[in-house]
Structure formats: C-alpha cells, structure tokens
Interface confidence: medium
Amino acid sequence: SWMWNQFFLLEEYTGSDYQYVGKLHSDQDRGDGSLKYILSGDGAGDLFIINENTGDIQATKRLDREEKPVYILRAQAVNRRTGRPVEPESEFIIKIHDINDNEPIFTKDVYTATVPEMADVGTFVVQVTATDADDPTYGNSAKVVYSILQGQPYFSVESETGIIKTALLNMDRENREQYQVVIQAKDMGGQMGGLSGTTTVNITLTDVNDNPPRFPQSTYQFKTPESSPPGTPIGRIKASDADVGENAEIEYSITDGEGHEMFDVITDQETQEGIITVKKLLDFEKKKVYTLKVEASNPHVEPRFLYLGPFKDSATVRIVVDDVDEPPVFSKLAYILQIREDARINTTIGSVAAQDPDAARNPVKYSVDRHTDMDRIFNIDSGNGSIFTSKLLDRETLLWHNITVIATEINNPKQSSRVPLYIKVLDVNDNAPEFAEFYETFVCEKAKADQLIQTLRAVDKDDPYSGHQFSFSLAPEAASSSNFTIQDNKDNTAGILTRKNGYNRHEMSTYLLPVVISDNDYPVQSSTGTVTVRVCACDHHGNMQSCHAEALIHPTGLSTGAGSEFRHDSGLNDIFEAQKIEWHE
C-alpha cells in the first residue's frame, strides 16, 4: 500500500534550488530499483517533478497561493521490467501554505459621502471596505483593521467595520463645507509588520435650516402714484439667508400696519426678493402714507432648530402715495335700470352719481353720449344725474338700450369719465295676439257636423313672464248664427268645426268667420281675425273636385289643417294630396 500524508508547500519560496515537496513511497519498494514512480495531474512534469527511483517530489517554480491554493495529482508505482502497476493509482493533494504577501485593498480609491451639518456625534457617514487576498482561515494575514490617518477630530472610523461617523458636535456647513478623510486598512489585526492600504473619503456637509432670514436694514421707503392699478410693483426688499436651496427659500408677508388691505407682497422665486405691490386702488385724498410691517420667513423649518429662535425677521416699509389729478368716479361700474314700455315722456328711470375724488372736490356735470343714443330717447339732468325719457318706448322694437353717460369736471373739462347704462324695457301687454298665418280652408258639401276642418294658431309680440296663453272664440256677432264653431283646445290652438250636416256651394260658396283671439294677460288684449272657408264639391273620399273659381288662384293655397298646399298650376284632380277629410255616407 501507499505510504504518505497530504503534502504542504509554502508559497512564494525564494531559495535558489528546487523546493522539496515530499516523498511518494510504496511498501512494495525493496530499494533495488525494480519500481518506477510516475506522477500525473495538476502541474505534473512542469511545476512538479518526481524522482522515478526514489519518489521524491520537488517544485520547480515559485507558487502563489492566491493564484492556486490546491493542486490535485495522481501517483503510480509500476514494475520497471513488466510495466505493470504494483499499486493501484492513487490521488493526492498538495496544499499551498499562505504567507502574508498581500496588503488590504479598498473597493474604491476615492469615496464620496454626505452628512447633514449639525448632525449628532456618531451619525453614520459612509462605510469603507478593504479586502485582503491572503488566507482568512489561517493566521491574521487577512484580518483587516481600519484607522483614521487624516480627518480628526471631525470624523472617526470603527476599526472592525470601516463605518465612518461624525465625531464633532455642531459641524457648521456655513463655516466649512468640505472635508477630506484618509482611512488606512492594515492586516495582521493591525499588529507590527502588517501590510496596509489607504483610501480617501471626500465628505460634504449638506445644508440644514439652521439660519433664519435676516433683513440687511430695518426700514425701507418707497413711493407710488395714487393712479397705480392693482398689481403694480412699488419696490423690492430682500432678506438674506446663509443656508442654501429650499432652506434659504423665503416667504414674505405683511403682518401688521395700516396698509395690510391696500398692499401685497409676493416672493420672486428666482431672486428670493419680496416685491411690494398695490392690492387695492389707492387714494391720495384718503391716505397719503402707509407704514407696513413685512416679515421674511423660512417656509421649510426644521423643528429641532427652533430653539435657536424664530426663523423669521421683520422690517418696516413706508409707502408714500403721490397725488394724481383724477377724473370723476361713478358710484357704480355700470348701471342697470328698468322702465315699463308704457312710460310717459319725462318719466324718471333712475339716476347716476359721480364725484371728483381729488381733494379739491370739483363739481361735475352729466351728459349723455349722443353716439350711444342717436335717437335722443333718453336725457339726463346735468346737475343731479337723473335719467328720464324724452321719447316713447316700445319693448317690441328694442328690449335693451345701452347708452353711455359722461361725467365732466366743470372746472377742468379734460377730466371726464364714462359709465355704461343698461336700460331694460319691461314688457307691458300692449299687443294683441294675431293669427300665425292667413287661414283659408275648405269644407266639402257633404261634410257632417262636428268635423275638424282647420287648426288655428296665434302669435303675440309681447313676452309674458310665464309664456303665452291664448283663448279663441267666435266673434259675438257671428257666434249665434254661424255655420261653424270654434273649439278652444286650451293649448294655444283652436279648431274650426262644422256645425251642420251638408253645405250648398250654390247657395253660399264662401264663409267668412270672425275669430276673437285673447291673450289672457293684464290688461287683456284681443283681436279679431277672419278665416275664409270655401265650400267645395268632393268625391266620396273627401278629395276636392271643384270649388269656387277664386279659390283656385289664391297664391297661399287651401288647407285642411294638415299643412296641405294648393298649387294654382295643378289640375283639379290633384289639387289636394293631403290628409283626407272623414267622409260619412
């Protein structure tokens, strides 16, 4: 049987001759040279050579454990004469023994990290990591210990983990923002003779809101004319803040003072300035000077720094209003007046009022802009602004009159103002309803009683509040003797019905029916319209065959109540193509 153990070989051998590994030996070997040892496997014949007589193995080259820590080889012992194995082939291992030949190497040459300013001592910054290629399972060659070479007293490093932490209280970004820290990693547990590597960590303090805004001056003064429209910028103020980014953002507000409702302050997002603007129309005559208290504050406050004091500052802003000569001002931007359409001439509709806003309070006179009232329907009392009619009105002609009134300072005619007047003419029931169209219809000679021959509709120029509601009836003079009746449908329509059985066109070829239409409004208006009814000869289907000659040439045609139309160029047989009138045999 084979007689050997596992072989060990020190890496990085520096001797001049081959490095002895060990000896293969079979108990069949009697030392007479009859056995031959053969080596095969990893590096056999190249890295490793064997003395075929003695079984001694040597390494021909310097080996690096970090390159290959284990070699697997096979050993054979054969009879030199016959070539037959005297032992079964056997596998064995050569294990390369570690020496501390590698220094720790950091995963990065340069690390960058950030940490908030004013962070508590021991706040995590970043973790650095160094690796050592030596054998971690044997000795301390790969046991790395971290230490800080540069960066104290601001930062510290945990020796075993490489975690860098803050080491100094109240590190202030506004004082110093950048730090360069050098960290060393040393193997052999940091002992003497250990190998080491270093890395640089660039640490930036990030901003926190630890500084309030501050006005560089306590008082500002601006001027603005009283004519400045709302939104006009008057001046700019700026508070400074040592912080950066959103921590340096400033909101301005008016917190006190008599001009709180007259002025606004808005923040210019680009410059972080406060722009004082006019909020409401100013009036020199009412107030000449305003004093405001303006506050600059940080919108993003960090509660843990509130102990440092309020994160705001205030300044006084004095605004002087300059006088401007102003035109008269009307009491309203526009006036809406109403007047009934039956108003008499010289009826007062309402009044306008304007006043010179200047301290002088110049008297004003009123006039109507005649370009807006060419027909001179309205007039105005130049002294008191009363509007009155100078002509009769008609809502049905014009519902709204839009005129302009001018107020002029008597002592300074260049100063004038205009105001629109919208005058609505209110409806009065002053129009009677009328037929919607000219009604001419026909009845067959053999028609039966109560037969509908025409539907009537009415129109009315008035506009009653809840809509038209017409009623229809025969005129009193015709009601008793008529051959036809009116049926009021109570829906703004009425029907003409036959009252008797049969009509004779030779006795009476045309009937004229006076129909009274009433609008039931207040006061009630009514009119009488005439419906012409022609008596015609019809076939047994109710189709007209012949009529009085006048009917044939009437341009509006005849109607059965179903919208049929008679064309004067048609033949008698196709005069009506419309709805057939019921026929009673």
Epitope: D463, P464, Y465, S466, G467, H468, Q469, N489, K490, D491, N492, T493, N520, D521, Y522
Partner: antibody, heavy 120, light 106 residues
Framework: QVQLVESGGGLVKPGGSLRLSCAAS????????ISWVRQAPGKGLEWVGF??????????NYAAPVKGRFTISRDDSKNTLYLQMNSLKTEDTAVYYC???????????WGQGTLVTVSS | DIQMTQSPSSLSASVGDRVTITCRAS??????LNWYQQKPGKAPKLLIY???NLQSGVPSRFSGSGSGTDFTLTISSLQPEDFATYYC????????FGQGTKVEIK
C-alpha cells in the same frame, strides 16, 4: 284628467347630485310653462325655477339660491320635465313639487311631491 | 325681490266663522296675486287667481280682493275641511310666497 307625478327623490350626501323627473298626462304638455317649487320640512313654499314652452323658446329662469347649481329641462316627446340638481347643500333638503303654470301666472295643477334629503 | 308678508301667521276659529287673511306686497304687483290651500302631506291647491278670480271647482265661500300691494282672502263660513295652511303668492316679478297662515280649530 290632468296629472303630474314627480320621481327621483332620495338621500344624497352634500356636494352630490340628483335628477328629479315630473311626468305629465291629461293635457297638451308642450304648450305649457312648468315650474318647480320646494318646501323644506315644516317650512313654507319656495319657488325654484321654471321652463317655458317650445313656442316661447324653452326659456328658463331660476331662484337666486339655486342659480348655477340646478338646471331645468324638458322632453316634450316624453311629456316629462326634469330638474338636475348639482353641488347639493343640506339646505336643499325639501319636498320638491312640479306645477303647471296657467293664465295670470298662477299654478293650477301640482304633483304630489318627492322628498330630497341632503345629509352626510 | 318682492317680499310677501302674510298675517296672521296662525289663527284659531270655529266652524261657521268668517275668516280673513291678509297679504301685503313690498311693491305693487298689478293684481298678480294668487291664494293656495295646503293640507299636511299634500300638495298646495289653487283657490283664487289674479286677486279675485275663483278657480274652477273651489267652493264659493272662498273669495279674494285687493289691488296694488294689499290683498285679502276671506272664507265666509268656515267648514271642517277648511282647516289648513293658506299661502299667498305674487306672480308679477318671478314668484314669491307669503310665509303662510295656519287655520286651526278653536
């Protein structure tokens, strides 16, 4: 006979919407202006709005408390009046009636009413 | 807006009594004044239109009068079915109602 029947009432949350209907029968619906009226529990009558007939251009008019939130419409082919109520408030809680507008601006026929409750 | 003020807001009466309810408009309303009767849980019912016109089917014991701004509803002889709330309504400019008068049994 003339009949008006309201429907569509119910419970709705503030800010919600509801559509009421008023079905008409027994008269020529298209010729009449129709009004909506409401009555809060234990309170008096309050006009809501109205719509004129086709002949008067379907003009609508609304009471100030509902203007901009309520819309009245009608479908003459279905003889139906509608009240679309949006952005409802608790003070809109009431029985809602539809009523036919007759001569001299009076309301001669009314529906039986439908209750609308606006509550969270 | 035109305001309508009804008085009294309630009254107690017996069957057979003559009852008068008044309604005042804040401005003239051209006789566009209507009277309605409402019973609990029911829709209002038109009694009088345009100040003095009796609606079809309404008993003749109901009558209305007045013009301009002052109007009156009279029930000549109160009947058991007349105990209800009565409202006046103006139709001259938009529509507004009085606050109602409740007629109760004495």
């Amino acid at each position: 006979q003339v009949q008006l029947v309201e429907s569509g009432g119910g419970l709705v949350k503030p800010g919600g919407s509801l559509r009421l209907s008023c079905a008409a029968s027994g008269f020529t619906f298209s010729s009449y202006a129709i009004s909506w009226v409401r009555q809060a529990p234990g309170k008096g009558l309050e006009w809501v709005g109205f719509i004129k007939s086709n002949a008067d251009g379907y003009t609508t008019n609304y009471a100030a408390p509902v203007k901009g939130r309520f819309t009245i419409s009608r479908d003459d082919s279905k003889n139906t009046l509608y009240l679309q109520m949006n952005s409802l408030k608790t003070e809109d809680t009431a029985v809602y009636y539809c009523a036919r507008i007759r001569y001299f601006r009076n309301w001669d026929y009314w529906g039986q009413g439908t209750l609308v409750t606006v509550s969270s | 807006d035109i305001q309508m003020t009804q008085s009294p807001s309630s009254l107690s009466a017996s069957v057979g009594d003559r009852v008068t309810i008044t309604c005042r408009a804040s401005q003239t309303i051209n006789s566009y004044l209507n009277w309605y009767q409402q019973k609990p849980g029911k829709a209002p019912k038109l009694l009088i239109y345009r100040a003095s016109n009796l609606q079809s089917g309404v008993p003749s014991r109901f009558s209305g009068s007045g013009s301009g701004t002052d109007f009156t509803l009279t029930i000549s002889s109160l009947q058991p079915e007349d105990f209800a709330t009565y409202y006046c309504q103006q139709g001259d400019s938009s529509w507004t109602f009085g606050q109602g008068t409740k007629v109760e049994i004495k």
